[in-house]
């Protein structure tokens, strides 16, 4: 009668959609020569095999090209390789060794394959820092994908200027040359597994290093509304004795170091304020002249100046000779 043998290992295996799994099978060591034949993997209850090495046997359309019998009698190997796993593959399987010449064959115990939703997501790796104007290679990788599966399709989405680099079964390279305006924007890598019809994605926010592009000064005079200057100003009239608050603001990433100087500073000048705020509690003759805000950044510096012109109060200055 039909001879039976036990599959070694677990009674069920789990695989995620789109991925691969190996159903282990070892032929009995005491296999009589005349019983040696072709190998067939069957879905429980089906007559047509899902995989076989019999050249005259058809396999199920649904599993053709995805299910493979790994046949190596020297190592007693009769394992089933499943790639591009689909939800419909969720079933019990068994192996049968059979020669059409013989009445009986060898039939294995059953093993259940459970196909779960894909939970893995692509990884996006960035080498070092993204610098404005400098090309960088970003890699989207799916290291959990098996080599023998249908290669996934990689799609990139970004507002930044990009070009596609090399790809492998498990990764895709994107060359990005970011601009300052690309800082904090989204970049998405989408991976589709055509064999199983599953798509996964990962989105990151770009952290782009760039030198200051704009520097501005906001001026607060007493209780009056602030106004902003965006370029070097030759003369700003200010009433003597008035309190003045100068607020310097610059872009750049990481944030630029802001400092205030009186006059037009040399590179190694000492600032009068090491922050972006310069408080002038009572404007007098000492404050007349130029004030410069410098935005310092590893990738470049920018500065803006304004010239204060002090209006004297009518009773203001003590008379001269």
């Amino acid at each position: 009668q039909e001879r039976r043998f036990q599959l070694e290992g677990p009674e069920s295996l789990t695989v995620q959609e789109g991925l691969c799994v190996l159903v282990p099978c070892r032929l009995p060591t005491t296999l009589p020569a005349s019983y040696y034949g072709y190998g067939y993997w069957f879905l429980e209850g089906a007559d047509v095999p899902v995989a076989t090495n019999d050249p005259d046997e058809e396999v199920q359309e649904e599993t053709r090209g995805r299910f493979h019998l790994l046949w190596d009698p020297r190592r007693k190997n009769c394992s089933l390789s499943i790639r591009d796993a689909r939800r419909r593959d969720n079933a019990a399987y068994f192996f049968r060794l059979k020669s059409k010449w013989m009445k009986y064959g060898y039939t294995s115990s059953k093993l259940s394959v459970r196909v779960m939703a894909l939970t893995h997501r692509p990884n996006i790796s960035i080498p070092g820092t993204l610098e404005s104007g400098h090309p960088s290679n970003l890699t989207c990788s799916v290291p959990w994908v098996c080599e023998q599966g249908t290669p996934p399709i990689f799609s990139w989405m970004s507002a930044a200027p990009t070009s596609l680099g090399p790809r492998t079964t498990q990764s895709s390279v994107l060359t990005i040359t970011p601009r300052p305006q690309d800082h904090s924007t989204n970049l998405t890598c989408q991976v589709t597994f055509p064999g199983a019809g599953v798509t996964m994605e990962r989105t990151i926010q770009l952290n782009v290093s760039y030198a200051p592009q704009k520097v501005a000064i906001s001026i607060f005079q007493g209780n009056s509304a602030a106004f902003k200057i965006l370029q070097n100003t030759s003369s700003l009239p200010v009433l003597e004795g008035q309190a003045l608050r100068l607020l310097c603001d610059a872009d750049g990433n990481p944030p630029a170091h802001l400092s205030w100087f009186q006059g037009f500073p040399a590179l190694n000048a000492t600032p009068i304020s090491n922050t972006g705020v310069l408080e002038l509690p009572q404007v007098g003759s000492a404050e007349e002249g130029d004030f410069t805000c410098r935005a310092q950044h590893p990738l470049g510096s920018l500065q803006i100046s304004l010239s204060l012109f002090v209006h004297w109060k009518p009773e203001g200055r003590a008379g001269g000779v």
Epitope: S34, N53, W71, R74, S99, K100, W101, M102, K103, Y104
Partner: antibody, heavy 116, light 107 residues
Framework: KVQLLESGGGLVQPGRSLRLSCAAS????????MHWVRQAPGKGLEWVSG????????GYADSVKGRFTISRDNSKNTLYLQMNSLRAEDTAVYYC?????????WGQGTMVTVSS | DIQMTQSPSSLSASVGDRVTITCRAS??????LNWYQQKPGKAPKLLIY???SLQSGVPSRFSGSGSGTDFTLTISSLQPEDFATYYC?????????FGPGTKVDIK
């Protein structure tokens, strides 16, 4: 003890017919495929024909196709080879053999000589 | 049909020698290859099946290897009773075909 005993060989004229028989013993005959293999004098082995356990699958070498017919009677534990339109090149020792895709047991053979 | 070739067609060797016989198929036959030994006036005897599986009762000095189209039968240390003719046979598809044989005789 597993045994295969061929009979029916002999001298026959070209164009005539001959029927070989193979009596099997020592194993469950209808579990196994059976084959005929021949060997011309001083030559190598040539697979002639094979038949599955239930006669559902049958195969022939091109050199005998259309002239030879393999059959079996499981109730009698016997394998047959009906040889028609015999030719001089069919002269050989005919072995009955047991097996699926691997022939593991051979009979001692019966000599068929086709000559005028 | 699948053609089988063997080399050498004959070889002379001494007791204790390591002997290697090769067999080639005209197309891939996976591991569906058997080796038989035949002595004059006797029926063939199965030595190796499935390219590398040793038939029960056959001495371990006989070994087989290969898959696809190229196969080898090795006798690690030739014994007096090993002088015979060796045949390979493919059982991948009908018609099953034998190689022409390799005769191993005494040097």
């Amino acid at each position: 003890k597993v045994q295969l005993l061929e009979s029916g060989g002999g001298l026959v004229q070209p164009g005539r017919s001959l029927r070989l028989s193979c009596a099997a013993s020592g194993f469950t005959f209808d579990d196994y495929g059976m084959h005929w293999v021949r060997q011309a004098p001083g030559k190598g082995l040539e697979w002639v024909s094979g038949i599955s356990w239930n006669s559902g699958s049958i195969g022939y070498a091109d050199s005998v196709k259309g002239r030879f017919t393999i059959s079996r009677d499981n109730s009698k534990n016997t394998l047959y080879l009906q040889m028609n339109s015999l030719r001089a090149e069919d002269t050989a020792v005919y072995y009955c053999a047991r097996g699926g895709q691997t022939i593991d047991i051979w009979g001692q053979g019966t000599m068929v000589t086709v000559s005028s | 049909d699948i053609q089988m070739t063997q080399s050498p067609s004959s070889l002379s060797a001494s007791v204790g020698d390591r002997v290697t016989i090769t067999c080639r198929a005209s197309q891939s036959i996976s591991s569906y290859l058997n080796w038989y030994q035949q002595k004059p006036g006797k029926a063939p005897k199965l030595l190796i099946y499935a390219a590398s599986s040793l038939q029960s009762g056959v001495p371990s000095r006989f070994s087989g290897s290969g898959s696809g189209t190229d196969f080898t039968l090795t006798i690690s240390s030739l014994q007096p009773e090993d002088f015979a003719t060796y045949y390979c046979q493919q059982s991948y598809s009908t018609p099953f075909t034998f190689g022409p044989g390799t005769k191993v005789d005494i040097k």
